[in-house]
Every structure is written in structure tokens, then in C-alpha cells.
Interface confidence: medium
């Protein structure tokens, strides 16, 4: 009569959710470090970069005590993807100096990734919304030269540690309210 | 390569202000919020306040709330600090940090307050 | 009187293993980061460890932090001469929300 009922499905503790989420979150947050710190021993920054493309900055001192977690996941998730789509297109696009970033580029685009998959296996398993499917995102012009793709390297790995680091802190503090 | 640099640091009577502004340069200065701290004579780290990487939210510690105000002009990559009604315990070095998170990763090298009759 | 509690001093010798506490509550230690800095002799702190075990670029892998409920512990492995600082351990406190930080623990080397 084929094989026999599987044990019932415990409801996820979603502080040990939100605990594995911060664990992937605080690794990839160490990769971007020292990737970050790979490029700029390669490659010295001289000054701040920007990119326009980047998402805006979504957490700071003052936000932390409004925090609500379908908003955080949503908003982390969206910025992570557009980081994550920025590194793909350095891959493709960064140039030759770039390509001494390899493997670590690799290995941080998919660990990226991942993370972006646990988010949104947590928002399903704490029966959050889902946010609508993203739009088409305008593809990203080509650096104009070889330190034009640097430059953006620094300012999209100077913007995924920033990112990271103020979600580790928002996740962390949103696991204490939970 | 991140730089922040103190200023505006002396001697000052009790009762009286000063201001100390933290020229910072290597960074986006508008995407960190940013931190005082200071440190009396032989004593430990205690923290003063953080302005917001936009202005827009302010937290200080209690012993300076009403006394103190912290600033920022995002356009000249400069973070100040308005210090009114001075004291003797007042009497530190005076430190500018950036937090990208949770931590003050990087610091200026301090300017010295005394303040004294 | 500090938020966090740190010891006033340790000391250990050259190539020996040493350990710093710092003990709080769950205001803050047992619900935020932990991060620690190092002061050396006349200059401005120095990020050392960040949300509990994390080492900013350049810091040698010889320091270490760790974390258990309301308590962290920073551990200096291969001590040398100069790992000889001030060494303070800081957290976000919930219930004063500000940042607090222990009183600092002088570190000589024998």
C-alpha cells in the first residue's frame, strides 16, 4: 500500500531560521572583506567610488528601532540581487585586470547566491509576502576602460560590505524580537 | 586609503563651548553613519553619540543629552560636534569613528578637550 | 562604573596563549555584536574583532573572539611584544540604546 506517512511536519522555529540566515549572511559578509581587500591591494582606491546602478543604502542608526522583518527581507533581498547581478556583469564585463579576481569572484557571485535562495526559503517558511516577480532590470553599460572596471569593482564590493554588514546587524536585532 | 581627521580641540572654561569638526576623505562619507567617542585622562572608551549617514536620526549617550549635538555636512565630508555647557569631567580626547554596522572601524586620531578654570 | 566588565589586567609571555572575559547581560552582549579594539600605547583604538569572531583585513589570524550567552572572550595566540595594548570589549546596550563598552584590560608582555 506503498510506503508509510513520513513523521509530521514540525512548524520551523524561526529564530533557528533567522539564525542559520545570519550565519550565511556574517560568511559572505567575511568574503567580502577580503575580497575587498584583495582588490585594493591589487588595484589601490584612490578616493570614494560610486556607481548610480547600486541600490541606495536601506539601514542605518536611526531605522534600526522600526525595524519589521517582512520589510527587511524584502528590502535585503531586492538590494542582493542587484549586488548580485552587478557581479556577474564584472565578470563578464569588469576587463583583464578583473580576471585576477578569479576564483574568488566565482565563489562569492555563487555564494551570493545561496543567500539569496535562503532568504527566500525564509520568507516562504515564516509565511511572509512574497514580493512580486522583479522587473527586467536595464542592462548595465560596459566600463568605458580597463580602470573604469576597477573602479566599479571597488564601489560594488565597497557597497555589498556595507550592505552585508547592516544586515547582519538588523537580522540579529530582529531575531531578539521574534 | 579611509582618513578622518579631529580639529577644533583646547582649552575651555567650565560653562563654555566649543566645537570639534572630523574632516574624513578616502570613502563615500554620505553612506556611514558616523560616531564621537572619547576617553578622559588614563581612563576607558565611552561613547558620545552617532549621527545617521543622512542627518536624519541622532542617539546620544545620557551624560552628554541637551549638552551636546552632533552634525554632519555631507557635502564637505565633514562631522561635527557642538559641545555647550562644558564641565571638568568633560576633559578628554575626543574621537571621530565611522560604523559601517555594529563596530567603529575606523577612527581619527583625537583632538584634546580641557576643560578649566 | 562600565556597562561591561572586563579584567583591569592580564599578562602572559612571548609565544604563550592569553585570554580576555567580558562579561554583560542580555541587554547587550546576550542580544547584540560584540566587537573589540586594541589601544597601543599613545594612539587611537583600533578595530580587532567584529560581530563576535569576525577579523577586520589585517589583523592576524593570532586573535580570536568568541561568544556564549551574556559573556565573549577574546583570545591572543603566539603572543608577542607588541600585543602589549589596552584591549576593550563593546556592545550595543537595548536598554540605555547606546553603545557601551568595558572598562579595558592592560595587556603586558613578560
Known amino acids: 500500500p506503498g510506503p508509510p506517512p513520513g513523521p509530521p511536519r514540525v512548524s520551523p522555529d524561526p529564530r533557528a531560521e533567522l539564525d542559520s540566515t545570519v550565519l550565511l549572511t556574517r560568511s559572505l559578509l567575511a568574503d567580502t572583506r577580503q575580497l575587498a581587500a584583495q582588490l585594493r591591494d591589487k588595484f589601490p582606491a584612490d578616493g570614494d567610488h560610486n556607481l548610480d546602478s547600486l541600490p541606495t543604502l536601506a539601514m542605518s542608526a536611526g531605522a534600526l528601532g522600526a525595524l519589521q522583518l517582512p520589510g527587511v527581507l524584502t528590502r535585503l533581498r531586492a538590494d542582493l540581487l542587484s549586488y548580485l547581478r552587478h557581479v556577474q556583469w564584472l565578470r563578464r564585463a569588469g576587463g583583464s585586470s578583473l580576471k585576477t579576481l578569479e576564483p574568488e569572484l566565482g565563489t562569492l557571485q555563487a555564494r551570493l547566491d545561496r543567500l539569496l535562495r535562503r532568504l527566500q526559503l525564509l520568507m516562504s517558511r515564516l509565511a511572509l509576502p512574497q514580493p512580486p516577480p522583479d522587473p527586467p532590470a536595464p542592462p548595465l553599460a560596459p566600463p568605458s576602460s580597463a580602470w573604469g572596471g576597477i573602479r566599479a569593482a571597488h564601489a560594488i564590493l565597497g557597497g555589498l560590505h556595507l550592505t552585508l554588514d547592516w544586515a547582519v546587524r538588523g537580522l540579529l536585532l530582529l531575531k531578539t524580537r521574534l | 586609503e579611509v582618513q578622518l581627521l579631529e580639529s577644533g580641540g583646547g582649552l575651555v572654561q567650565p560653562g563654555g563651548s566649543l566645537r570639534l569638526s572630523c574632516a574624513a576623505s578616502g570613502f563615500t562619507f554620505s553612506h556611514y553613519d558616523m560616531n564621537w567617542l572619547r576617553q578622559a585622562p588614563g581612563k576607558g572608551l565611552e561613547w558620545v553619540g552617532v549621527i545617521s549617514y543622512d542627518s536624519s536620526n541622532k542617539f546620544y549617550a545620557d551624560f552628554v543629552k541637551g549638552r551636546f549635538t552632533i552634525s554632519r555636512d555631507n557635502s564637505k565630508n565633514t562631522l561635527y560636534l557642538q559641545m555647550n555647557s562644558l564641565r571638568a569631567e568633560d576633559t578628554a580626547v575626543y574621537y571621530c569613528a565611522r560604523t559601517p554596522g555594529s563596530h567603529f572601524d575606523y577612527w581619527g586620531q583625537g583632538t584634546l578637550v580641557t576643560v578649566s578654570s | 562604573q562600565s556597562v561591561l566588565t572586563q579584567p583591569p589586567s592580564a599578562s602572559g609571555t612571548p609565544g604563550q596563549r592569553v585570554t580576555i572575559s567580558c562579561s554583560g547581560s542580555?541587554?547587550?552582549?546576550?542580544?547584540?555584536?560584540v566587537n573589540w579594539y586594541q589601544q597601543l600605547p599613545g594612539t587611537a583604538p583600533k578595530l580587532l574583532i567584529y560581530y563576535d569572531d569576525l577579523l577586520p583585513s589585517g589583523v592576524p589570524d593570532r586573535f580570536s573572539g568568541s561568544k556564549s550567552g551574556t559573556s565573549a572572550s577574546l583570545a591572543i595566540s603566539g603572543l608577542r611584544s607588541e600585543d602589549e595594548a589596552d584591549y576593550y570589549c563593546s556592545a550595543w546596550d537595548d536598554s540605555l540604546n547606546a553603545v557601551v563598552f568595558g572598562g579595558g584590560t592592560k595587556l603586558t608582555v613578560l
Open positions: 542580555s541587554s547587550n552582549i546576550g542580544n547584540n555584536a
